[in-house]
Amino acid sequence: GITNINCSGHIWVEPATIFKMGMNISIYCQAAIKNCQPRKLHFYKNGIKERFQITRINKTTARLWYKNFLEPHASMYCTAECPKHFQETLICGKDISSGYPPDIPDEVTCVIYEYSGNMTCTWNAGKLTYIDTKYVVHVKSLETEEEQQYLTSSYINISTDSLQGGKKYLVWVQAANALGMEESKQLQIHLDDIVIPSAAVISRAETINATVPKTIIYWDSQTTIEKVSCEMRYKATTNQTWNVKEFDTNFTYVQQSEFYLEPNIKYVFQVRCQETGKRYWQPWSSLFFHKTPETVPQVTSKAFQHDTWNSGLTVASISTGHLTSDNRGDIG
């Protein structure tokens, strides 16, 4: 940055090089150029010469004043007009930053996605700080008192192998930057209570043309967790409101769920699961689309990449996995 230039004098900022956004600041420039009594001192911000709020303090020093400075980053440098010099002479430069102290991190959440081998901890960092803000995640065993700290700039993945102080821990997050430090409340966790089962996936759907047409959704998960509770939500694509069905599930075989749906309508399905009685849910699965037939039986399968006629009877179409605003990956 501009701080690496060779200086013939120096530049400094009051109250500091990193300051709270919206503050009034002063930038001082002091020349120390051989055989030069500066006629004039100039300030530049991001390469553009400043015209106003410059005060000459003495023969070698000038001050530039900004009211309500709101730019997150700026490169400042100053120059001198020396007698007998055709060009301005560079004095010095400095990068300045403005921002905010961190908010108290809240909504600290730690989960273990089955098979991942990691505990993933996230939190709400609060408002944007605009300046470099680091987070320290503290994990303290309730059994041994041993504490581990992890430095990060966002979320953290902690190998479950490194959690050797038993099953019960306290987790908290400390946020710090040049303008302040804050700390979250402590979250108490038990490793067995925060496991999220392996993702449930809808593989295909078929509508059986009976007296009352019936749609069967096939779905599965690779989870080894025995007691799993799941929710499947579905709606016509033209609707805003979801219908939700609940299931107690044993994934030793592919699940088949029956729905009695309106004919000739495009529906969308999603599924999510949790270990029964535990706190955290999987995010909702990708959107699975299925259009009910007017009269002809229909199968929808992810295996097909486009609409295909099968023996002239069954329509098969892809389930497009595009996420919508309804498909936020909430785990709470």
């Epitope: 320290v136 503290h138 008192e145 581990q148």
Partner: antibody
Framework: QVQLVQSGAEVKKPGSSVKVSCKAS?????????MCWVRQAPGQGLEWMGC?????????YYANWAKGRVTITADESTSTAYMELSSLRSEDTAVYYC????????????WGQGTLVTVSS | IVMTQSPLSLPVTPGEPASISCQAS??????LAWYLQKPGQSPQLLIY???KLAAGVPDRFSGSGSGTDFTLKISRVEAEDVGVYYC??????????????FGGGTKLTVLG
Amino acid sequence: QVQLVQSGAEVKKPGSSVKVSCKASGIDFNSNYYMCWVRQAPGQGLEWMGCIYVGSHVNTYYANWAKGRVTITADESTSTAYMELSSLRSEDTAVYYCATSGSSVLYFKFWGQGTLVTVSS
Amino acid sequence: IVMTQSPLSLPVTPGEPASISCQASENIYSFLAWYLQKPGQSPQLLIYSASKLAAGVPDRFSGSGSGTDFTLKISRVEAEDVGVYYCQQTNRYSNPDIYNVFGGGTKLTVLG
């Protein structure tokens, strides 16, 4: 067995600074550990000053009253922790202890022998 | 977090039991330690994790409690137990507002 050996007694003038050292032996410097500093004014109780956490990164924590005046550092190459106290006043006359368990717990199995710092004009 | 210890002084007859109380201003789980500081010596750890006896400490010392209320008990006081006893919260020191992590101390004297 962890041993903590502190530097000798100091007499300082008000307004000056003091730096006390604490050499540790028996700590596994590849593991995470806390090294903390506690002081005790004559006839008074124990007063926590701050700690340094050494692990995959280094973090320091200070008592509210000590912020801006106390600096705790650690030199892993010499297994030595330091506590510097600036802007000394007569109330800072105390015995200064370093303390640790040699791990990342906050109770202290091991204490240094103490360093008496006297602040007097 | 503020640690409040009581009583301030505790005169006990040898062979009699003694009890010291420590209260935390907020939940510190079981993260509490007890120390004894004998005259002219550095403090020594007696109890950690509220109830675990440190190595080499006689089993007449015991600790109990969790959350905010904690107790140190000496089943039969001996002459060598004299000194000042301190409790210490060992939950977290990263909180920006901590002033002291130790209680004010309880001076135990042996009568007779």
